[in-house]
Interface confidence: medium
């Protein structure tokens, strides 16, 4: 169950899905990927204030302990809850191959 | 597959399992948990430098883009890769109940 999607820090400041455009050169893939030439990378970015999109019990504990010991325990972190698959056309010794990567593009985000 | 467990920042500085002792009061559980009275909370704390314990392709992408756009893209974050279960004995309206929580204590850490 998703704990509160209302961001107390203001619109767009809390953990959510962002899209960052990246070239193969940006990603360091130019020597082994043929296509796509550019990737719309979806990733999870933003703050994780108390109970916002808490992934599980561990995230709730982390929030409580961060409040008590901010120098020791970091706040929960915005990370992918699930992924969208993506097909890369790769160079091989003999030609090309298609490979599906299941853990490349974030689909949904939560705090943990 | 675990990407490099050698921490370039110095011993103990990178993403790893830490134990933080917490009372029921610390966790805000005093009104609904009977036992344990104190929890040895295992959690993932530490930096995620390039390729250190990279969880997946997404983490590798994040590292690359963070290097290029540090103000836009955060570095990967140290989070649980797996959990240890824990039994909480809880107060109920009529008495007590036992509940296993599978997502309470971090068992292993990675960067994502």
């Amino acid at each position: 169950a998703r704990n509160g999607d209302h961001c107390p820090l203001g619109p767009g400041r809390c953990c959510r899905l962002h899209t960052v455009r990246a070239s193969l050169e940006d990603l360091g893939w130019a020597d082994w990927v043929l296509s796509p030439r550019e990737v719309q990378v979806t990733m999870c970015i933003g703050a994780c204030p108390s109970q916002f999109r808490a992934a599980n019990m561990h995230a709730q504990i982390k929030t409580s302990l961060h409040r008590l010991k901010p120098d020791t325990v970091p706040a929960p972190c915005c990370v992918p809850a699930s992924y969208n698959p993506m097909v890369l056309i790769q160079k091989t010794d003999t030609g090309v191959s298609l490979q599906t990567y299941d853990d490349l593009l974030a689909k949904d985000c939560h705090c943990i | 597959a675990r990407n490099g467990d050698h921490c370039p920042l110095g011993p103990g500085r990178c993403c790893r399992l830490h134990t933080v002792r917490a009372s029921l009061e610390d966790l805000g559980w005093a009104d609904w948990v009977l036992s344990p009275r104190e929890v040895q909370v295992t959690m993932c704390i530490g930096a995620c430098p390039s390729q250190f314990r990279a969880a997946n392709m997404h983490a590798q992408i994040k590292t690359s883009l963070h290097r290029l756009k540090p103000d836009t893209v955060p570095a990967p974050c140290c989070v649980p890769a797996s959990y240890n279960p824990m039994v909480l004995i809880q107060k109920t309206d009529t008495g007590v109940s036992l509940q296993t929580y599978d997502d309470l204590l971090a068992k292993d850490c990675h960067c994502i």
């Epitope: - | 039994v87 004995i89 109920t92 008495g95 109940s97």
Partner: antibody, heavy 116, light 110 residues
Framework: EVQLLESGGGLVQPGGSLRLSCAAS????????MSWVRQAPGKGLEWVSV????????YYADSVKGRFTISRDNSKNTLYLQMNSLRAEDTAVYYC?????????WGQGTLVTVSS | QSVLTQPPSASGTPGQRVTISCSGS????????VTWYQQLPGTAPKLLIY???QRPSGVPDRFSGSKSGTSASLAISGLRSEDEADYYC???????????FGGGTKLTVL
């Protein structure tokens, strides 16, 4: 008055099975977690198993894990302990007790003897 | 070998005060309440102290419990002959996900 009455004990050969029952009365059985505790002749108490009030959670001592099964029928106010693959070291008086951590009421116990 | 450690025996004369110790670790006594049980010869155990120091109704105030760190103790003041019994400490162990007892202490009233 709270009462717990165990039954089903007896003599059984090694490798055999027994099913113990504990009939509860004098309280709302479905509100309480219930436990089994055993005591070998001349020895101390050993916790065996606990089951939550609704039967959804069950925990066992390592010494009986995989061989014993705790269950309950709240409509009959009865707690059970199915014991399979019995060993000589399972010989003991078996008590049912109310609660998971503070055993505030105990039955009189039923003796299980595992011997050839 | 019990997870909780108790002395196997203790003794005292009528009117005396005796203390029974119970030692454990951070995963049991260190992080949980302790319960004490009294078992009179030939009978089922009886709850004596719960939540480390609380007495159920009907238990005389001669019996008291305390806990410090990973140890607990049961004190019996004004010892009586009817106190002659076996005494067990017990608590939940968070690492084992199960309940653990001490080996028991046989109290003799001299």
């Amino acid at each position: 008055e709270v009462q717990l009455l165990e039954s089903g004990g007896g003599l059984v050969q090694p490798g055999g099975s027994l099913r113990l029952s504990c009939a509860a009365s004098g309280f709302t059985f479905s509100d309480y977690a219930m436990s089994w505790v055993r005591q070998a002749p001349g020895k101390g108490l050993e916790w065996v198993s606990v089951i939550s009030h609704d039967g959804s959670s069950k925990y066992y001592a390592d010494s009986v894990k995989g061989r014993f099964t705790i269950s309950r029928d709240n409509s009959k106010n009865t707690l059970y302990l199915q014991m399979n693959s019995l060993r000589a070291e399972d010989t003991a008086v078996y008590y049912c007790a109310r609660g998971p951590i503070n055993f505030d009421y105990w039955g009189q116990g039923t003796l299980v003897t595992v011997s050839s | 070998q019990s997870v909780l450690t108790q002395p196997p025996s203790a003794s005292g004369t009528p009117g005396q005060r005796v203390t029974i110790s119970c030692s454990g670790s951070s995963s049991n006594i260190g992080s949980n309440y302790v319960t004490w049980y009294q078992q009179l010869p030939g009978t089922a155990p009886k709850l004596l102290i719960y939540d480390s120091s609380q007495r159920p109704s009907g238990v005389p105030d001669r019996f008291s419990g305390s806990k410090s760190g990973t140890s607990a103790s049961l004190a019996i003041s004004g010892l009586r002959s009817e106190d002659e019994a076996d005494y067990y400490c017990g608590t939940w162990d968070s690492s084992l996900s199960g309940y653990v007892f001490g080996g028991g202490t046989k109290l003799t009233v001299l």
